[in-house]
């Protein structure tokens, strides 16, 4: 059990107060993390509270300012990037968000040696992506879907691509679906380790159907937003990978990297690129039916100035029980011999573990094993491999950092974080300096987050980087809810849940229950992390019990649970939420006449299906920006889990799993449906179709739209949204205002 101390003592009770909705909306109890911007083995940069860019040297304990807030302010910079030769800094301003990761900005280059901005051959605006080479101060940037190269910041640019065209051809940046569902980045270009070569992707969206929606704005006529967006079964982008020599870019121009034959024989995706050396690159490809992935290691042929990808350097990863990988196919971490690598994939028992591949995947050496999962490989050095897993004490919702000594035989394993601040910290990530000389640990909870700096050799803590003292003090007079993480065993399935209980929780009383659900494939909601959010308020002030349940389809507990939902989305995720609710009722403290469910995105889909399950368990529920039919969602995501919406594949389940098909079943529940009209991700179409089906079935429901808002419902919409949902729930639970 993880109990977050509420710090309530009888003598203090009258000085303590409950959380308010205002606290949540104002972000009063938000926390800070500290991720060093490493520039060497022992130095990092950090933006100070007053906006100076400061260089810290761990070994001397000294720091000095390299760029003043005055310089930052002179161009309204909100971000910066130091060139690896430490001569220049790019300053980023006029940030303009596009999709989840992408944005455009204006860039200025500041010369540190001369204390002035670089004049002449200034960068165009707005730029879609810009980055320094890994060595020196070459610049690559994307402007109007084309890639440009500068040898030095003050030099004229060399144009690498010429065919870039809005919504048609994307060079060096992903299109919508690759950004959101495959790369999870705003960029699609990669420098080789010493900056000799630049690899980039070209996405051709010419034949992709376009989603169009109105953006109302302030004008007399609304604008129409058009996005090439392949829905399930539609035509996909065509991807090609090119590499150019940045020293002599005009010599032979960009050279295309060949696609493995077994991949190229049908529709496919490019999934990631990893440079190994300046003359060796590793590409990962995936069949459109995403159960076969190929990792291809390619070498530069000096004589032909081309890239050769021999079949002997192709490694196939295939899943027979589900899709390849977890959410994404994992990426390799190469060792110092520049050919062998470490990679996370399923072992014979169906748990994701680290494997060492020297020649073939069949001969892979398993590095970690057990009924838990390795989650991320942070760094491989000559003698150590650092990774995270949820092994410790068998809590899948924890993350600890481990070190395996690979320089010695047999390799020994040490948990770096397990016993550091055991009550406070059970969910970590890490950030390593060059050669893992030092590293920062960022602990996200369950206690108040804390960031610390450590010696990479001894693991000794050097200093606290951020401990959120102000937050700790602010929470001293707050009655926080209690949290517990436990599990239910039902029909050979383990259902982990987090329960958030009112501060003065009494098992002999009855409380209204709110289920918060996400439930998407390879997600995890039950995590040992700190949060003071809307559901904390509902427990603290409104006396609700809130529960989160990780059912079938969720991650980090083995393939049996993960792949249970393969080709059957919308069935087991819903069943498991219902099963958990029944178990919670059996615990005796839930008022079974006051049970609600709510979720956002995939969670909106699950909450809608749960409300329409006909069980009579739920009095009311909320769906925010729900998917309503898998035919409306993106191809890359949907087909990974559902296959194709064709007669000879899985059309039947596509049709059976819609929210609309269950319109009749909403008659006996109170349903609140919410969506942003400018949602580029889960299109407003989804909620429009639910509403139409409910109207056609003459079923009453409540709805709220947010004009010109996307999938995140940010800004003032957030306040309106949570206020509106609070009123809805309080009315449903007969709680006074």
């Amino acid at each position: 059990i993880v109990l977050r101390p509420s710090r309530v003592h009888n003598s203090e009770e009258n000085t303590m107060r409950a959380l308010t909705l205002k606290d949540i909306l104002n972000g009063t109890f938000s926390y800070k993390t500290f991720f060093p911007n490493w520039i060497s083995g022992q130095e990092y940069l950090h933006q100070s509270a007053d906006n100076n860019i400061v260089l810290y040297n761990i070994e001397t304990g000294q720091s000095y300012t390299i760029l003043s807030n005055r310089t930052m302010k002179s161009v309204n910079a909100s971000n910066y990037g130091l060139s690896p030769d430490r001569q220049f800094v790019y300053l980023e301003s006029d940030y303009s968000k596009l999709w989840r990761y992408s944005y455009t900005a204006t860039y200025y280059i500041y010369d540190l040696s001369n204390g002035e901005f670089v004049r002449g051959n200034e960068l165009p605006r707005p730029i879609q992506y810009l980055c320094w080479s890994p060595v020196g101060s070459k610049l690559a940037y994307v402007y109007q879907n084309n890639i440009y190269l500068k040898q030095r910041p003050g030099d004229p640019p060399f144009q690498i691509t010429f065919n870039g065209r809005e919504n048609k051809i994307f060079n060096g940046i992903p299109d919508w679906v690759y950004e959101e569902e495959m790369l999870a980045t705003k960029y699609a270009l990669w420098w080789s380790p010493n900056g000799k070569f630049l690899a980039y992707a070209e996405f051709n969206d010419t034949d992709i159907p376009v989603i169009a929606y109105s953006y109302y704005g302030d004008e007399q006529y609304p604008r129409t937003i058009n996005i090439p967006y392949p829905k399930a079964g539609a035509k996909n982008p065509v991807v090609r990978i090119f590499i150019i020599d940045t020293t002599y870019p005009a010599y032979v121009g960009p050279q295309e990297v060949p696609v493995p034959a077994m991949i190229a024989s049908s529709d496919y995706y490019f999934s990631w690129l990893t440079w190994v050396t300046d003359e060796r690159v590793c590409l990962q490809w995936l069949k459109r039916v995403q159960n076969v992935s190929v990792l291809s290691i390619c070498d530069f042929r000096e004589d032909w100035q081309t890239w050769d990808c021999p079949k002997t350097q192709e490694h196939i990863e295939e899943s027979r029980t589900g899709w390849a990988g977890g959410f994404f196919v994992s990426t390799p971490v190469f060792s110092y011999d520049a050919i062998s690598y470490y990679k996370i994939f399923s072992d014979k028992d169906g748990y994701k573990h680290i494997h060492y591949i020297k020649d073939t995947v069949e001969n892979a050496i398993q590095i970690t094993s057990g009924k838990w999962e390795a989650i991320n490989i942070f760094r491989v050095t000559q003698d150590s491999l650092f990774y995270s897993s949820n092994e410790f004490e068998e809590y899948p919702g924890r993350r600890n950092i481990y070190r395996i000594s690979i320089g010695s035989y047999p390799p020994s394993k040490k948990c770096v974080t397990c016993h550091l601040r055991k009550e406070r910290c059970q969910y970590y990530t890490a950030s390593f300096s060059d050669y893992a000389k030092y590293y920062a640990l960022v602990c996200y909870g369950p206690g108040i987050p804390i960031s610390t700096l450590h010696d990479g050799r001894t693991d000794q803590e050097i200093k606290i980087l951020e401990e959120n003292k102000e937050l700790e003090n602010a929470l001293k007079n707050i009655q926080l809810p209690k949290e517990e993480i436990k599990k239910l065993e039902v029909d050979e399935i383990t259902l982990w849940y987090k329960m958030i209980l009112p501060p003065q929780f009494d098992r002999s009383k009855k409380y209204p229950l709110l289920i918060q659900v996400y439930g998407g494939p390879c997600s995890q909601s039950v995590r040992s992390v700190f949060a003071v959010n809307w559901i904390s308020y509902l427990a603290s002030k409104e006396g609700m019990v809130i529960a989160l349940v990780d059912g079938r389809g969720t991650a980090f507990q083995g393939d049996k649970l993960l792949y249970a939902v393969y080709r059957k989305l919308g069935v087991y995720e819903v069943e498991d939420q219902i099963t958990a609710v029944r178990k919670f009722i059996e615990m005796g403290f839930i008022d079974e006449k006051r049970i609600a469910i709510w979720g956002w995105s995939y969670g909106g889909y699950v909450s809608s299906l749960a409300l329409a399950s006909g069980t009579g368990l739920f009095k009311c529920g909320i769906a925010v920006a729900p998917v309503s039919s898998w035919e409306y969602y993106a191809s890359v995501y949907t087909e990974r889990f559902m296959g194709l919406p064709t007669k000879d594949d899985n059309l039947e389940h596509y049709k059976n799993s819609t929210v609309m098909a269950r319109a009749e079943y909403f008659r006996n529940v109170d349903y609140l449906l919410i969506h942003g009209t400018a949602d580029d991700n889960v299109h407003f179409q989804n909620s429009a179709q639910i509403a139409k089906a409910l109207v056609n079935a003459q079923v009453d429901f409540q709805a709220m739209w947010y004009s010109d808002q996307n999938h995140g419902l940010s800004g003032l919409s957030t306040n309106h949204l949570y206020t509106h949902m609070t009123h809805f729930l309080k009315q449903c639970f007969s709680l006074s205002d």
Epitope: S40, E43, E59, Q62, Y64, I66, L112, S113
Partner: nanobody, 117 residues
Framework: QVQLQESGGGLVRAGGSLRLSCAAS????????MGWYRQALGNQRELVAG???????YYPDSVKGRFTISRDNDKNTIYLQMNSLKPEDTAVYYC???????????WGQGTQVTVSS
Amino acid sequence: QVQLQESGGGLVRAGGSLRLSCAASGSIFVGNAMGWYRQALGNQRELVAGITSDGTTYYPDSVKGRFTISRDNDKNTIYLQMNSLKPEDTAVYYCNLWPPRIGFASWGQGTQVTVSS
């Protein structure tokens, strides 16, 4: 008072060699990354070599293979060994923190290197 004193410059024929020294006083230089910079007449100051506290070095392509930066932490001194000098290496050479500290008035006087053809 923090000071940087560069020395070792002079007139040399193309293809010749020079060794520059920079003596640093003040705690900020102890253990921090240091660099050699140069400024030719009418040009901007530019980096020619950098060295971190653990001895990792960096050189731009224009001097790679010809110049070598080193440091003697006991003497608080950094050096620049310049071989195969070319006329385009003619400039005033300075040492400083790498990257330089802002508002750092004490760039030294520098040392003049002239390479004749």
